[in-house]
């Protein structure tokens, strides 16, 4: 498929790359699996070549995508395999500790259970985890002490605390307490919830609906869940099996997802429903070996092999010996597209079908017998100086017209014989023997040696090459492993180590990463090469849609903290603020808290009272005591706001009651009486014959004996009674109860008399008051 056009017409972004405009130019934006200006190269970093936590970077080397490693601390080399000289190489961590490098000279040991200290050299008394039930073990001298959690006690925290025995009970609002090991459980009434039944039960708060379901209250204590597509159950806890009635074809296996399903296809098929045929010939350039031709078929492929090869992928050398006609007793050796018959003694010919005439020694002694490979007849090769069919005639070889030395050998005549000086590659008395360069077995790895003039040729077994077949053919040279698979060269074959996400002989099959249902929270999974993409439902994000989108970022709450929910948020307002976004400042002055005319100023979750002079306190509720200095001389001080008022005693006036009123000012004494001023009054000194207060009256009011139990004193225009003991009142007519003051002591009983009292004493006491 052609990618989108990018930059120049005709150029395309390959391998799923997207053409995007940036900074006024167009460029290919590649998926993670490919790199390069047109996304033409597999990403070399996908196979994670950098070891020991090294970081892989894609680099361009003469137009080809390659990688470079940035090594972590303590490592170097192209793949970060070589440790630099560092502290961890000195094996500082004892007793099975693991060394972590901090700098090249500093390290930290991670000690196994039972050991501690910088080098894991100290035995740990807490190693056996003696403190049960989450108790914290602290080494103490040569032993340990357990700090137990609240639910357990005892030296090793093994004794359960019965929380239900506490008073008052832990379960509120009529909840029933059940003690459990290490905890307790409250069974609440329908109206309450919470660990201790402390909260009124509000349906949907919190929501019991799982997998993103939406909760709706249906009553005071009931709810129902509206589930996301793909889920069911009272609380949406069940993933609906979407596989029944699936469309997976051609042997594809259905894998259930969330509100969807995926088809896991057999190697020959691909596509969403395994309906698309995999073109193995395009996918695997080396599907047919040894020059075979690949033909794609529906649901597979087949190979048309060249002469001499067979098998599904043309990897098997045809055994030509199976149909060979080597005669009985001959040994057949298979070659590529041919065979060779090794004859037994006495037989000859290509198929060992001829009797070897040399067996009967027809040639004269000293002659050499050769067999004609066509008819099996003997050919006598005579020694120097002899001729004839059986080499029985002596010859002067060199004087003959034909040179007796074969293969252009130089003839040197000798008595009764001759010698030949042979050219290179030949030997024997007549240079008739082609030197057999195969004698030294120069061909390695079971190859067949072909002797040639002055040289040899090795016919190699499959998988080997070179003059001596000494080179193991690099079957990896053609880079047969797809998707950045690592090719391992073997004898006449190769093996692909596939990167994560790919499988098959050539790493040609994309593993269906959606099969494990990696996408969470109702997300849809889209499979890709060595990857998958999750399409998230509303409110979720992250590679696996595992992250609840934080609607609290950016923080929408003006004056409060944000609590994230699924596709929503709640603002928990700071004291003094309200509103959906805590944007409204509550006016604390609206309740008019400032007393005594104080002015209120609103603040954050507070108010400030500015008090009038003479008042104080947060709410101006305290009226300062202006009477504290006792300003009223002869009167009672009444405190006011920022001041006081004096209520004067009779006879005094002025703002501080410090002026004695002159009652004589109005001349109250008549008939020549002299006035003497007093406090709140006056006294008239009357001339003789006048006696009432203002010297007006001449009458003696005592004449009528008004005082019943007392003596009468005449006064100006009136009288006064001086009462007898035990009596009181204006006219001494009220009998006083002298017993009121409990005068009788030591348990004596008091009896009130007309004048006085009488004590009746207890035994052993006497006297007027039993004292």
């Amino acid at each position: 498929a052609r990618g989108p056009r990018c930059s120049q017409p005709g150029e395309t972004c390959l391998n799923g790359g997207k053409c995007e405009a940036a900074n006024g130019t167009e460029a290919c934006v590649c998926g993670g699996a490919f790199v390069g200006p047109r996304c033409q190269d597999p990403n070399p970093c996908l196979s994670t070549p950098c070891k020991n936590a090294g970081t892989c970077h894609v680099v361009d080397r003469r137009g080809v995508a390659d990688y470079a490693c940035s090594c972590a601390l303590g490592f170097s080399g192209p793949l970060c395999l070589t440790p630099l000289d560092n502290a961890c190489l000195t094996n500082p961590c004892r007793n099975g500790g693991t060394c972590d490098l901090l700098t090249l000279t500093e390290y930290k040991c991670r000690c196994p259970p039972g050991w501690s200290g910088k080098s894991c050299q100290q035995a740990d008394p807490c190693a056996s985890n003696p403190c049960a039930n989450g108790g914290q073990c602290l080494p103490f001298e040569a032993s340990y002490i357990c700090h137990c959690p609240p639910s357990f006690h005892g030296p090793t925290c093994r004794q359960d605390v019965n929380e239900c025995g506490q008073k008052p009970g832990l379960c509120r609002h009529g909840g029933t307490c059940h003690n459990e090991v290490g905890s307790y459980r409250c069974v609440c009434r329908a109206t309450h919830t919470g660990p201790n039944c402390e909260r009124p039960y509000v349906p949907c708060s919190p929501s019991p609906c799982q997998n993103g379901g939406t909760c709706r209250p249906t009553g005071d204590v009931t709810h129902e869940c509206a589930c996301l597509p793909g889920f069911t159950g009272q609380n949406c806890e069940e993933n609906i099996d979407d596989c029944p009635g699936n469309n997976c074809k051609n042997g594809g296996a259905c894998v259930d997802g969330v509100n969807t399903y995926n088809c896991r296809c057999p190697p020959e098929w691909t596509g969403q429903y395994c309906t698309e045929d995999v073109d193995e010939c395009q996918l695997m350039p080396n599907a047919c070996q040894n020059g075979g031709t690949c033909h794609n078929t529906h649901g597979g492929y087949n190979c048309v092999c060249v002469n001499g090869w067979t098998g599904e992928d043309c990897s098997e050398n045809i055994d030509d010996c199976a149909s060979a006609a080597c005669f009985h007793g001959a040994t057949c050796h298979d070659r590529v597209a041919s065979f060779y018959c090794e004859c037994p003694h006495g037989r000859t010919g290509l198929l060992c079908h001829l009797n070897d005439a040399c067996i009967s020694n027809p040639c004269n002694e000293g002659s050499n017998c050769d067999t004609n490979p066509v008819n099996g007849k003997a050919i006598c090769t005579c020694p120097s100086g002899y001729t004839g069919p059986a080499c029985s005639q002596d010859v002067d070889e060199c004087s003959l017209g034909a040179n007796p030395c074969e293969h252009a050998g130089k003839c040197i005549n000798t008595l009764g014989s001759f010698e030949c000086q042979c050219l290179q590659g030949y030997t024997g008395p007549r240079c008739e023997i082609d030197v057999n360069e195969c004698v030294s077995n120069p061909c390695q790895n079971d190859a067949t040696c072909l002797d040639q003039i002055g040289e040899f040729q090795c016919i190699c077994m499959p998988g080997y090459e070179g003059v001596h077949c000494e080179v193991n053919t690099d079957e990896c040279a053609s880079s047969p492993c797809l998707h950045n698979g690592r090719c391992l060269d073997k004898i006449n074959e190769f093996q692909c180590e596939c990167p994560t996400g790919f499988t098959g002989h050539l790493c040609q099959y994309d593993v269906d990463e959606c099969a494990s249902t990696p996408c969470k929270n109702g997300a849809k999974c889209l499979d890709g090469p060595n990857t998958y993409t999750c399409v998230c439902t509303e409110g979720y994000t992250g590679t696996h849609c595992e992250v609840d989108i934080d609607e609290c970022d950016p923080d929408p709450c003006h004056y409060g903290s944000c609590k994230d929910g699924v596709a929503t948020f709640t603002c928990l307002c700071r004291p003094g603020y309200t509103g959906h976004h805590c944007e409204t400042n509550i006016n604390e002055c609206s309740s008019q808290p400032c007393r005594h005319g104080g002015t209120c100023q609103d603040r954050d979750n507070a108010y400030l009272c500015f008090c009038l002079k003479g008042t104080t306190g947060p709410n101006c509720e305290i009226n300062l005591d202006d009477c504290a200095s006792s300003p009223c001389d002869s009167g009672t001080c009444l405190d006011k706001i920022d001041g006081y008022e004096c209520a004067c005693e009779p006879g005094y006036t002025g703002s501080m009651c410090n002026i004695n009123i002159d009652e004589c000012a109005g001349n109250p004494c008549h008939n020549g009486g002299t006035c003497e001023d007093g406090i709140n009054g006056f006294t008239c000194r009357c001339p003789e014959g006048y006696h009432d207060p203002t010297c007006l009256s001449e009458v003696n009011e005592c004449n009528s004996n008004p005082c019943v139990h007392g003596a009468c004193r005449d006064s100006l225009n009136g009288y006064k009674c001086d009462c007898d003991p035990g009596w009181s009142g204006t006219n001494c007519d009220i009998n006083n109860n002298e017993c009121e003051s409990n005068p009788c002591v030591n348990g004596g009983t008091c009896k009130d008399m007309t004048s006085g009292y009488v004590c009746t004493c207890r035994e052993g006491f006497s006297g007027p008051n039993c004292q």
């Epitope: 080399g77 395999l81 070589t82 440790p83 000289d85 190489l89 000195t90 961590c93 000279t105 080098s119």
Partner: antibody, heavy 116, light 115 residues
């Protein structure tokens, strides 16, 4: 280039203490440990311990625990080794070495003879 | 038994290969051990040659000729220093070293004589 210059030869009586110094140059003193290795006449090498000039942390061979002191003075780029309670078998050439785990650069050695 | 054992001497002809062994005590894991090799000529301090842990974790010190290489023989629980094409200047003592239990341990040394 890296150099480790050691103090001169010493002749000591049994029971006394010897102190050898090792002045370094050509690299950052705190980037490597200073190891001490000795070699008795005609014998093999014996590692004694190292000091980390960064924090004066030391590590000893168990054999020398208690009578070996190693220090590093970063202001003078100098390491020192002190061996107490000397005995005749402490007669050896004492080397200071720069390295971490690989004992890469060696001083020329200081000959210490213990004899009554 | 010594932690590291080296044969006391070894002879080699010029141009031949010499293989020096450093046998680890049986309780020490060869696979996880990193073996360091040093050369010492008479009257001189030792010289660091190389360290060998595996083919991917080996390190020839700068200036050391490439004829020196490290390897391991798992069947003998031994580290090996190979000098391929021995030269007369290679006549020296050779010491192996490992880090064991937080400390450094040397072998007894092997004297190499070039014939």
């Amino acid at each position: 280039q890296v150099q480790l210059v050691q103090s001169g030869a010493e002749v000591k009586k049994p029971g006394t203490t010897v102190k050898i110094s090792c002045k370094v140059s050509g690299y950052k003193f705190t980037d490597y440990y200073i190891h001490w290795v000795r070699q008795a006449p005609g014998k093999g090498l014996e590692w004694m311990g190292f000091v980390d000039p960064t924090d004066d942390e030391t590590r000893f061979a168990e054999k020398f625990q208690g009578r070996l002191t190693m220090t590093a003075d970063t202001s003078r780029d100098t390491a020192s080794m002190e061996l107490s309670s000397l005995r005749s078998e402490d007669t050896a050439v004492y080397y200071c070495i720069r390295g971490i785990a690989a004992l890469a650069d060696w001083g020329r050695g200081t000959m210490v003879t213990v004899s009554s | 038994q010594a932690v590291l054992t080296q044969p006391s001497s070894l002879s080699a002809s010029p141009g031949a290969s010499a293989s020096l062994t450093c046998t680890l005590r049986s309780d020490i894991n060869l696979e996880t051990s990193r073996i360091y090799w040093f050369q010492q000529k008479p009257g001189s301090p030792p010289r660091y040659l190389l360290r060998y842990q595996s083919d991917s974790d080996n390190n020839l010190d700068s200036g050391v000729p490439s004829r020196f290489s490290g390897s391991k023989d798992a069947s003998a629980n031994a580290g090996i220093l190979l000098i391929s094409g021995v030269q007369s200047e290679d006549e020296a003592d050779y010491h192996c070293m490992i880090w064991h239990s937080g400390g450094s341990v040397f072998g007894g040394g092997t004297k190499v004589t070039v014939l």
